[in-house]
Interface confidence: low
């Protein structure tokens, strides 16, 4: 006769492991007992359980409550056992020894492999700011047995680097994602993808990128200087910028205080009916926690009466 078993039995942490051992004998042969032992190299064989044809199942105190026979119906030539709730320490070599009558004793070995699915964690790098060079955006670490695979899924351009640390029964893998921060990356997802044979599907952890920036400031409203004449109503200057965090705006006049009647409404400077008093240099100051920007414009309010007077003088001079 001969023993039928598996070279390797693979289970996920916490699952039940079936350790197969079936004696395929000639007609009339009987199995008297099946002994299961832990048979790791460098250690003496530690008995796990013994199935006796008359006295039933015996379990070592070290495995009490964790070793069972498969549910009925049972074949008397089947010496398989169930190891409940496999833990990482169960991983290793096992030996099945079958005592038969009249053929004698047979033995076979198998390896139990316990997969430990990873529990990944994602940690963001330092605050991202536009203008930085290559910067750590996030690192993702996963520990398991065997070593998990850690990759990144994102539309953001960047570089990855991985390192692995081997422990006695597992391995930790850390992957870092570096990028050169730009404002276009704001709000973009950066997803760590962890693959492992103990997982039914990849584990994905998403981090949303936040990149601080402040765009150059500019002022709109002076495109047509001829509109800035005495008496004009509804004249306004608007400061243009954008940033993350969203910026605040402040208006000042370089050559003195803001004239009375001029209204500041966030990014907009509203003027009452224009007079020559409104001529001057106006500064828009844009700032957020990241940076600040200034933009200044010169307002020159035209007085038609002054202009016509000048023209008359010129004519008379000729």
């Amino acid at each position: 006769g001969e023993l039928e078993t598996s070279d390797v039995v693979t289970v996920v942490l916490g699952q039940d492991a079936k350790l197969p051992c079936f004696y395929r004998g000639d007609s009339g042969e009987q199995v008297g007992q099946v002994a299961w032992a832990r048979a790791d190299a460098g250690e003496g064989a530690q008995e796990l359980a013994l199935l006796h044809s008359k006295y039933g199942l015996h379990v070592s105190p070290a495995y009490e409550g964790r070793v069972e026979q498969p549910p009925p119906p049972r074949n008397p030539l089947d010496g398989s056992v169930l190891l409940r709730n496999a833990v990482q320490a169960d991983e290793g070599e096992y030996e099945c020894r079958v005592s038969t009558f009249p053929a004698g004793s047979f033995q076979a070995r198998l390896r139990l492999r316990v997969l430990v699915p990873p529990l990944p964690s994602l940690n963001p790098g330092p605050a991202l700011e536009e203008g930085q060079g290559l910067t750590l955006a996030a690192s993702c670490t996963a520990e398991g047995s065997p070593a998990p695979s850690v990759t990144w899924d994102t539309e953001v351009k960047g570089t990855t680097s991985s390192r692995s640390f081997k422990h006695s029964r597992s391995a930790a893998v850390t992957s870092e994602f570096h990028l050169v921060p730009s404002r276009s990356m704001n709000g973009q997802p950066l997803t760590c993808v962890v693959s492992h044979p103990g997982l039914l599907q990849d584990q994905r952890i998403t981090h949303i990128l936040h990149v601080s920036f402040l765009a150059e400031a500019s002022v709109r409203g002076l495109e047509d200087q001829n509109l800035w004449h005495v008496g004009r109503e509804g004249a306004m200057l608007k400061c243009l910028s954008e940033g993350q965090p969203p910026p605040s705006y402040n208006w000042t006049r370089l050559d003195g205080p803001l004239p009375s009647g001029v209204r500041v409404d966030g990014d907009t400077l509203g003027f009452p009916p224009l007079t020559t008093e409104h001529s001057g240099i106006y500064v828009c100051h844009v700032s957020n926690e990241f940076s600040s920007r200034d933009s200044q414009v010169t307002v020159d309010v035209l007085d038609p009466q002054e202009d016509s007077g000048k023209q008359v003088d010129l004519v008379s001079a000729s």
Epitope: L122, N123, P124, H207
Partner: nanobody, 122 residues
């Protein structure tokens, strides 16, 4: 690992109401912030509202006064009551959650649900 399952989406007329629910399961002992994002066709995903375990809330300007987020910590469930719905609220709504790690350190691990579609149309 945390699993998030949304429900309550559907078709509603402008001005109508819907209530979305999101139940968390799995490794949920340390869920910190829960909330909702949405993504309209052809647009980027945007924050709608979030709520801490202590009940502090955050709303996008576009939904303030119309949407109300609430949370049942005992059942690890977050709700989004949406009133006075507008066509521009049409989007896939995603539940999100993060967790507190050991020693109370915030882990920026963000978990997402599969999304539930809200369509506002007459």
């Amino acid at each position: 690992q945390v699993q998030l399952v949304e429900s309550g989406g559907g078709l509603v007329q402008p001005g109508g109401s819907l209530r979305l629910s999101c139940a968390a399961s799995g490794s949920i002992f340390s869920i910190n912030v829960m909330g909702w994002y949405r993504q309209a066709p052809g647009k980027q995903r945007e924050l709608v509202a979030t709520i801490t375990s202590g009940g502090s809330v955050n709303y996008a300007d576009s939904v303030k006064g119309r949407f109300t987020i609430s949370r049942d910590n005992a059942n690890n469930t977050v709700y989004l009551q949406m009133n006075t719905l507008k066509p521009e609220d049409t989007a896939v709504y995603y539940c999100t959650a993060d967790q507190l790690g050991p020693l109370g350190l915030l882990s920026p691990t963000i978990y997402w649900g599969q999304g539930t579609l809200v369509t506002v149309s007459s």
